[in-house]
Each structure stands twice: as C-alpha cells, then as structure tokens.
Interface confidence: medium
C-alpha cells in the first residue's frame, strides 16, 4: 500500500479474511514467509553494514529537485562523434524496510504536524473491545536508504567478446581476434585497440569507424579461425555504467508513527488496525485523518518506507 | 604492390646495422604480419622475425634471433629490422615478406609479397 | 622448436614428367603450410598456402595436399620453366610457444 510521496509505506498484502485455508496449509505459509524474512533480514543487514562501512566518507548532500520535462526537437548531431555513445540515465532511491515486532503498529496520518502531536502525547489509551489498553507512540527509527542515478552508455565504437578459448598464448590471442575483427567479409572492420583477457576469454574490440560494432552485432557469434579449428565466439554490446549522485539518507519517519505495548492481545490483527484507525482519527484523542494502519499480533511484517 | 629492402652493406664483424622495408602500393593493416626472411649464398631461406601490422605490434622471432636482431615498424608503410654484434655467419640476402591473412579456412596463407632482398656482407 | 624437414634434397625428372616432394612437420602443423618455388637470384614465389589452395595465377599442375606431420607438393606435366628450388614453410600459433616459423631446406628440381 503506498501513501504520498514523501513518506510512503507499503505493507505486506494479506490474505483476504473471506480465504479459507486450511491449518496446516497456513502453518506451511507462514513457516514460509519467515525463513524468508530471516533470509532478507540477514541480507538487509549484510548489506546495511557493507553501505555503511563503503560509504560513510562519500556522503553528500544534494537536493534534486522534480522536474517536469517536455520532448521539444530531434537534436542533428554536428559530427559522427556524437553518435559514438547511446546513453541512457535511471533515478533509484531504495525503499527502506522496517520490521513491525509483536505488539506493536505502524500507523501513518496524512498530515504531519497530527502524526508529531499523537508523539508528543506519547501514551494512548485504546479501547479494544472490552480492554481499555494503553500504547505508547514513538517516531519510527528508520535506517539508511540510498539514491542514485544510473548512468548506461551502450558504445557504438566497441564490443564485447567471450567464450574466447585459451588456447593462445596472450599476444597471439591479441592479434588473432584483431585479425578476426578486421575482416569485411564477416561484418569487420579496422581495429583501433583489443583489450584480452585471457583469464575470463573475454575482450573488449575497439573499432575505428561507427557503424562496425553495430554490423558484427547482428549475429550473437562471430567466428574465430585458430589452427584451421572455427571457434565461435560471442559478441554482445560493449556497456559502461556509472554511478553519480550517490546519496545516503536516514531520519524519521514526519508522518508514520510507531504504536507499542499489545503484545498481550490475542485478536484478528484487521479487527485489532480498524480499533486503532477508529480511535486515531479522533481530534480529541490527538489524531486526524488516517492514512494507513498496520499491525503485527503474530510474526513480524515488514513495512517499506519510500522517501 | 610491392615491397623493397634497403641498408644492405659491408660491415666489419662486431657491428650493427638497420635494414629498412618499404611498401608500396598498400600500407600496413590487421590483415598483415611484416617479415624479415635471410638466406646465405647457396644456401637455403631463415626465417628471422614477423611483426603484426595492427595495433597491438605484437613481435615474433626466431629463437637464435632473439635479442640481437629487432623488428620495428616505423611507419604505416615501413619495417625495420636493426641487427647487433654482427658476424660472417650473418652474411646473406635479408627479403622482406608480407604475409597475408584471409581468415576464411584458418591461419597460414604464406608470403605472398616479397622484396628483391638486400645483401649484407660481415667481413673484416 | 619447429623442424621441417624436406625431402629430397634434389630430384631430376624429365619434361612433362611428374615431380613430387615431400615435406614432414615436427609436430602437427593443421595444414598451416605454404610451398614457393625460388629461381636463382629471384626472391620466392608463393605457390601453394593452406597445404592446398593454389595462390592466384599458379597454374593447376602445381598440386599441395597433406595434414597433420605429412603435406607433399606434387609438379606434374613438368616444362623447362618449373626448373628452380622448391621450400616448404609452416607457420604455427601455439599456446606456450612463440609464433614458430620454419623453412624445409628446400628441394632442388632439375628438368631434362
């Protein structure tokens, strides 16, 4: 489930409570979903430790703005060599996961300053069913989230060669893919520079004229003559990818808010969220407009906060 | 097209000496190897060294070759081929070869362009 | 090191006779062998590359076959002008050595 841009949270679907499944059949899913979760969390982690450690001295700080674009002109290059690269650019901005424990609730209001008032009142009394139970509310302690942009280039210049069989040695291997490469009958062209590497059997071919790659690059093979054997080995695109705008993000959360101390209840959790939703979008309780409400009676969820 | 040596002379043994190869009617490619190829009076041909006439220049030589004799190429048209510590034993008309590859059925397709060759005569 | 060893060393035979020299690799050579005829005096002439394929302009008598150690040049309705020294060459790429390159001594052919 998403809520608005700045500070979405996307909860796990559930089953539909109209879904009858049997014991043992659900006992199997849920067993299921938490090796899974155990799985991710400890990945989640892996790589929370890897950024942190990777990127603590690369953090910036850079607002990118949104900005709407319109398609006005096809551009007519001045020269060839504006054609030599086609590169293309993708924002990601990771979703940052968090685990709603037993007993507790994640509830998101759509307006900020009610979400800060419902903290700053911290303890809430709830009455679920014939229970008059007291929760507190928290900020939700998020951990880090990263954004990117993605740089691909696909060269018009180069290509990738591999499955490229050791059975050279290294400069003869350079000269017999040159070689290879060079031929107009197989879709070639001259050679400007072959980067082997023998350990992977792969190269990367670097044409003199545009347009080469491109005619190689129609057949996935090229062929490649060593001592009258035909080896065919294979072409594909040369890419570059960069990474730019590299930033690092962490906070709290302005409009969700973490709900404790239910651990004692052995309800529905759907019941348990309408109760919640019911009492919080009172003014006199605190609350206002609610956007989302989901809580963990059972296993933990895990709830993805977009930025 | 064609190919002609130059440098052939009379050395005294201990010397060195630059042989120079020039193409005409083509210029080097990834399609050739130039060549250096000897042969003494009445006797039969050496191969002596190929250099790769693309990029990468890449260099092969005959083992007793090795470090006393280099092949360098020097323009998209000439080839060298400088000797050191010269001896009789070295006295024979050096050809330039071209070898050309098709590629199509697998290595080795032969000289098929030669000089007229140059005599280099090492005598005291 | 790559040895070609060529046989025999002379040979005569008559005009419009038949001629055949033999040409042994050291190791396998995969029919990355040429064969040139040389006059005195004349550099080589490129006959017979890929141990078959005649070059252009080399007439069909001039016959190459063989592979692996074994490739023979074989010079059939001989004339006057086929007169020369014949040579065998190899060229092969290999994974541990140098680009090996090697001559046969070469074959003199004389026609009576």
């Known amino acids: 489930m998403e809520a608005d841009k700045d500070d979405t949270q996307q909860i796990l679907k559930e089953h539909s409570p109209d879904e009858f499944i049997k014991d043992e059949q659900n006992k199997g899913l849920i067993d299921e979903i938490t090796k899974k979760n155990i799985q991710l969390k400890k990945e989640i982690q892996k790589l929370e430790t890897e950024l942190q450690e990777a990127t603590k001295e690369f953090q910036i700080k850079e607002d990118i703005p949104e900005t709407k674009m319109k398609f006005l002109s096809v551009e007519t290059p001045e020269n060839d060599s504006q054609l030599s690269n086609i590169s293309c650019s993708f924002q990601v901005s990771s979703k940052v996961p968090y685990e709603i424990q037993k007993g507790q609730a994640l509830i998101t209001f759509e307006k900020e300053e009610v979400a800060q008032n419902v903290v700053s009142m911290s303890k809430h009394h709830v009455q679920i069913k014939d229970v008059n139970l007291e929760v507190t509310a928290k900020p939700v302690p998020l951990n880090s989230g990263v954004r990117f942009q993605v740089y691909v280039e696909v060269s018009k210049m180069k290509i990738n060669v591999t499955e490229i069989p050791d059975t050279l040695r290294e400069d003869q291997m350079r000269d017999k893919l040159e070689l290879s490469f060079s031929k107009s009958r197989n879709g070639g062209g001259e050679v400007d520079r072959v980067d082997y590497d023998r350990q992977s059997g792969s190269a990367v071919i670097t044409f003199v004229e545009i347009g080469v790659a491109d005619k190689i690059l129609k057949k996935k093979e090229y062929p490649l003559y060593i001592n009258q054997t035909c080896h065919r080995v294979t072409v594909s695109p040369y890419t570059e990818i960069h990474l730019k705008k590299y930033q690092i993000f962490s906070g709290t959360s302005k409009r969700t808010v973490l709900l404790t101390g239910m651990e004692g209840i052995q309800m529905d959790e759907e019941i348990v969220e309408d109760l919640i939703n019911i009492h919080f979008q009172r003014a006199k309780n605190g609350g206002g407009e609610v956007d989302v409400v989901k809580c963990s009676l059972g296993q933990p969820h895990i709830a993805y906060f977009e930025e | 097209q064609s190919l002609e040596e130059s440098g052939g002379d009379l050395v005294k043994p201990g010397a060195s000496l630059t042989l120079t190869c020039t193409a005409s009617?083509?210029?080097?490619?990834?399609?050739?190897?130039m060549c250096w190829v000897r042969q003494a009076p009445g006797k039969g041909l050496e191969w002596i060294a190929c250099i790769y006439a693309g990029s990468s220049g890449s260099t092969y030589y005959a083992s007793w070759a090795k470090g006393r004799f280099t092949i360098s190429k020097t323009s998209s048209t000439t080839v060298t081929l400088q000797m050191t510590s010269l001896t009789a034993a070295d006295t024979a008309t050096y050809f330039c070869?071209?070898?050309?590859?098709?590629?199509?059925?697998?290595?080795?397709?032969?000289?098929?362009?030669w000089g007229p060759g140059t005599l280099v005569t090492v005598s005291s | 090191a790559l040895v070609m060893t060529q046989t025999p060393s002379s040979v005569s035979a008559a005009v419009g006779g038949t001629v055949t020299i033999n040409c042994q690799a050291s190791?396998?050579?995969?029919?990355?062998l040429a064969w040139y005829q040389q006059k005195p005096g004349q550099p080589p002439k490129l006959l017979i590359y890929g141990a078959s394929n005649l070059e252009s302009g080399v007439p069909s008598r001039f016959k190459g076959s063989g592979s692996g150690t074994e490739y023979t040049l074989t010079i059939s309705d001989l004339e006057c002008d086929d007169a020369a020294t014949y040579y065998c060459?190899?060229?092969?790429?290999?994974?541990?050595?140098?680009?090996?390159?090697?001559f046969g001594g070469g074959t003199e052919v004389v026609v009576k």
């Open positions: 060459q190899s060229r092969l790429y290999s994974r541990i050595a140098d680009r090996a390159n090697a």
């Open positions: 009617g083509f210029s080097f490619s990834s399609s050739y190897y």
């Open positions: 070869a071209r070898e050309y590859s098709y590629d199509d059925y697998g290595d080795f397709w032969g000289f098929n362009l």
């Open positions: 190791q396998n050579i995969y029919t990355n």
